[in-house]
């Protein structure tokens, strides 16, 4: 039960995280005009990964796309790449994790396959989250650098007769959305990896000890009082007593003809 919950929660957290990464990537407010210690301009500038916008006090907002690839800063291109890679990996991870969910049955998929898929999706979510966090952090670093450079220009360029309104940019809402979303995707991925360990069937094959008693020859498995006659012949949902503290999740179940997706 705990494994199913961990897997389900990991999936939901990752889903929210990836939705957040997509939202952050599409948002226009990656950097916003710094209003502190600035003349009160009737124009508010903000920029995203794909376009820059200007909101006038009249209420009119104009956005212009960056219709060039070569003319854009390499850092911006890198951030775009990181965010897109994060989205793609996250989307694939979500697709894989849907089929890996314990509560969903697909044909005669074994738990070992589900465990592998859970681990794969978990790793994908972790990488996706790291890509988003890296992308947002690179952009934030770029902003900080430019902020202090423009601040320096602001105070050194006052010698002339004509003053200019120096537009400085600070962190926009998209950065915080991106950090949180990346973190959630990362956490979701870790949870999927943890769930994978619980899903994987135990590989240790204990050697059955034979006791020659009078009558039938019966092999006993240590740890339980259930007589075993070879391979698992338990039918699904049949409760068996096991001396070990195993959860129902750990009991390998086999699909019957009544199982549907």
């Amino acid at each position: 039960m705990a494994v199913t919950a961990c897997q389900g929660l990991g999936f939901v957290v990752s889903l929210i995280g990836i939705a957040g990464i997509i939202a952050a990537t599409c948002m226009d407010q990656w950097s916003t005009q710094d209003l502190y210690n600035n003349p009160v301009t009737a124009v508010f500038n903000y920029q995203g990964l794909w376009r820059s916008c200007v909101r006038e006090s009249s209420g009119f907002t104009e956005c212009r796309g960056y219709f060039t690839l070569l003319g854009l800063p390499a850092m911006l291109q890198a951030v775009r790449a990181l965010m897109i890679v994060g989205i793609v990996l996250g989307a694939i991870g979500l697709l894989v994790s849907i089929f890996a969910l314990k509560c969903i049955r697909i044909g005669s998929m074994e738990d070992s396959a589900k465990a592998n898929m859970t681990l794969t999706s978990g790793i994908m979510f972790i990488v996706s989250g790291l890509c988003a966090i890296a992308g947002v952090s690179v952009f934030a670093n770029m902003l900080v650098t430019n902020f202090w450079m423009s601040t320096a220009n602001m105070y050194t360029g006052m010698g002339g007769m004509v003053q200019t309104v120096q537009t400085r940019y600070t962190f926009g809402a998209a950065l915080f959305v991106g950090w949180v979303a990346g973190g959630l995707t990362l956490i979701g991925g870790v949870m999927m990896c943890i769930a994978c360990r619980g899903l994987a069937p135990e590989e240790t094959n204990y050697k059955a000890v034979s006791y020659h008693a009078s009558g039938h020859s019966v092999a006993y498995k240590p740890g339980g009082f259930k007589a075993s006659t070879g391979f698992g012949s338990n039918t699904k949902n049949k409760k068996i007593y096991d001396g070990g503290a195993r959860t129902e999740d750990e009991v390998q179940s086999y699909p019957s003809k009544h199982d549907y997706v």
Epitope: A42, V43, Y46, V54, S58, F60, R64, Q163, T164
Partner: antibody
């Protein structure tokens, strides 16, 4: 068509108060920022105040900040200018205007006259 | 506050003549975000409220004749009337629409010879 009509002007004594109104019609009032501009007897134009479309942000000229308050009522499609502690230099023709692209005033009312005199 | 200086204060012209009015601001009106200059030109005829001619320094308001042309960037702007008509006789004001408080120039009076 777009129409702006100011009212509430008149003769007032120094130190007195007055509330100007600007009734708007012919456009979606709640979608536009609005401004008050005055014209002195010497024909100089002076920007008085502006208010955002949502009414949340207001801006006043430094010389009038403490005395003049701009507000709007979307239900009545009306812009207001509350003036207090009036001085003789506030004597002017007060216009209300609708802000458009470039923050420019694309429509103006005919103006209401305010005379501050003892 | 941004100071707006218009010159000349008055100008006497003949019909059909080309006229250039200038406006200087004490601070740049160029917004880096959209590379637009927040300078507006208005025309005011006697007994009427001002009328919007040009915004963003060079964009003509709809309905304004194409003989009116705005140009300039940063702190220096001009309004050119390519061929003055009798109906163009008015006072022309420039305005800073970039930094609060918005400020107007003193105006240029256009008179007919």
């Amino acid at each position: 068509q777009v129409q702006l009509k100011e009212s509430g002007g008149g003769l007032v004594k120094p130190g007195g108060s007055l509330k100007l109104s600007c009734a708007a019609s012919g456009f979606t009032f709640s979608s536009y920022a609005m401004s008050w501009v005055r014209q002195t007897p010497e024909k100089r134009l002076e920007w008085v105040a502006a208010i955002h479309s949502n009414g949340g942000s207001t801006y006043n000229s430094d010389t009038m900040r403490d005395r003049f308050t701009i507000s709007r009522d979307h239900a009545k499609n009306t812009l207001y200018l509350q003036m207090s502690s009036l001085r003789s230099e506030d004597t002017a023709l007060y216009y209300c205007g609708r802000q458009s692209f470039g923050n420019a005033l694309d429509y103006w009312g005919q103006g209401t006259s305010v005379t501050v005199s003892s | 506050d941004i100071q707006m200086t218009q010159s000349p204060s008055s100008l006497t012209v003949t019909a059909g003549e080309k006229v250039t009015l200038t406006c200087k601001s004490s601070q740049s009106l160029l917004n880096s975000g959209n590379q637009k200059n927040y300078l507006t030109w208005y025309q005011q005829k006697p007994g009427q409220p001002p009328k919007l001619l040009i915004y963003w320094a060079s964009t003509r308001e709809s309905g304004v004749p194409d003989r009116f042309t705005g140009s300039g960037s940063g702190t220096f702007f001009t309004l050119t009337i390519s061929s003055v008509q009798a109906e163009d006789l008015a006072v022309y004001f420039c305005q800073n629409d970039y930094v609060y408080p918005f400020t107007f120039g003193a105006g240029t009076q256009l008179e007919l010879k």
